[in-house]
Interface confidence: medium
């Protein structure tokens, strides 16, 4: 097993707001990661960079710096939030997300995350990609793993 394991657990919550005039959707998506240090020494989680894609278009980016340190044979669960905007050429989604006649307005988003860990100045980067369902029609809190979208495109663990 690699010395640092990063596991994308899933979407924890998605908070939605709209701009009616611009036909724009704002989604604040909080994700959960498990980072396991299989080494016999501590490592620093220097930064987490994340982006969210919808229909192959990047709709949001985030970066967290100087996050935490993880002791030997230890694991930390880290939440990070990516603010996303669905607008302009994707404003057609506004109608779907605000449609009252349907209860759940799930869209499929691709979550990409890169974790940079350091030890004595040496950096290691680990990336993950996951497809997730997110409801763009209401504020939602998910049980971990509940939002997972399984299809043939999804890279295996």
């Amino acid at each position: 097993p690699r010395s640092i394991d990063v596991k994308y657990i899933g979407v924890k919550s998605a908070y939605v707001s709209y701009d009616v005039q611009k036909r724009t959707i704002y989604l604040n998506i909080t994700n959960t990661l498990n980072i396991t240090n299989n080494n016999y020494y501590s490592v620093e989680v220097e930064n987490i960079t994340a982006q969210v894609q919808f229909a192959k278009t990047v709709i949001g980016k985030a970066r967290l710096n100087n996050i935490t340190h993880i002791g030997p044979l230890d694991m930390k669960q880290i939440d990070y939030t990516v603010p996303t905007v669905i607008a302009e050429e994707m404003s057609y989604m506004y109608d779907f997300c605000t449609l009252i006649s349907i209860k759940v307005h799930n869209i499929v988003l691709m979550m990409q995350v890169t974790v940079t860990t350091t030890y004595f100045g040496h950096s290691e980067q680990i990336s993950q990609e996951r497809y997730q369902y997110v409801d763009c029609g209401r504020n939602t809190t998910y049980q971990l793993g509940q939002s997972e979208y399984l299809n043939v495109l999804q890279p295996q663990q």
Partner: antibody
Framework: QVQLQQSGAELIRPGTSVKVSCKAS????????IEWVKKRPGQGLEWIGV????????NYNEKFKGKATLTADKSSSTAYMQLSSLTSEDSAVYFC?????????????WGQGTTVTVSS | DIVVTQTPLSLPVSFGDQVSISCRSS???????????LSWYLHKPGQSPQLLIY???NRFSGVPDRFSGSGSGTDFTLKISTIKPEDLGMYYC?????????FGGGTKLEIK
């Protein structure tokens, strides 16, 4: 002062299992790793595996995967090693020891050892 | 797994002697970051092993200064400057750099 108190000697039938305990005192249990080591008569020390009691994450010597299972109970500051499907080859003295997170001093304090005898 | 070879297997001594025990690993014990986790232990019959030296050359608390460690990379040495009766027993080196940790086969320090 730092102490690791192990459970008493065990006489076990072949094919059964045994759980050896290692109770820590005199230090912060979750700030140190717990190592397990095997010593058979006439043979050298053999490293079995290590557990971080805070996270429960383990790392095993390949030879002992499936044989030894390491666990820890934070509330009682006790580490455990379960040995399964016992044979005469498992008759040995088993030691626990602690290792420092920060300085990576490996196995600085040891338990007194638990003798496991497998016999029908 | 890392193979750790200790020599000699047996070391007959007289009290007052100076002796050296060698420990050689199948690959470097210095990790990417320049740290080397090599320890020495003394194990006497009926007792628990006791840590003598860690990190190649650091004496553990309470260990007499007649014990010293040296080496780098793959070759390490434990020196005992003046053998005393309480020094008799089995000596082991342990590499803690790589997973899994591995002990050397041991060196028996016994009276001639």
């Amino acid at each position: 002062q730092v102490q690791l108190q192990q459970s008493g000697a065990e006489l076990i039938r072949p094919g059964t299992s045994v759980k050896v305990s290692c109770k820590a005192s005199g230090y912060a249990f979750t700030n140190y790793l717990i190592e397990w080591v095997k010593k058979r008569p006439g043979q050298g020390l053999e490293w079995i595996g290590v557990i971080n009691p805070g996270s429960g994450i383990t790392n095993y010597n390949e030879k002992f995967k499936g044989k030894a299972t390491l666990t820890a109970d934070k509330s009682s500051s006790t580490a455990y090693m379960q040995l399964s499907s016992l044979t005469s080859e498992d008759s040995a003295v088993y030691f626990c020891a602690r290792s420092d997170f920060i300085t990576t001093v490996v196995a600085d304090y040891w338990g007194q050892g638990t003798t496991v005898t497998v016999s029908s | 797994d890392i193979v750790v070879t200790q020599t000699p297997l047996s070391l007959p001594v007289s009290f007052g002697d100076q002796v050296s025990i060698s420990c050689r690993s199948s690959q470097s014990l210095t990790n990417y970051y320049g740290n080397t986790y090599l320890s020495w232990y003394l194990h006497k019959p009926g007792q628990s092993p006791q840590l003598l030296i860690y990190g190649i050359s650091n004496r553990f608390s309470g260990v007499p200064d007649r014990f010293s460690g040296s080496g780098s990379g793959t070759d390490f040495t434990l020196k005992i400057s003046t053998i005393k009766p309480e020094d008799l027993g089995m000596y082991y080196c342990l590499q803690g750099t790589h997973q899994p940790r591995t002990f050397g086969g041991g060196t028996k320090l016994e009276i001639k």
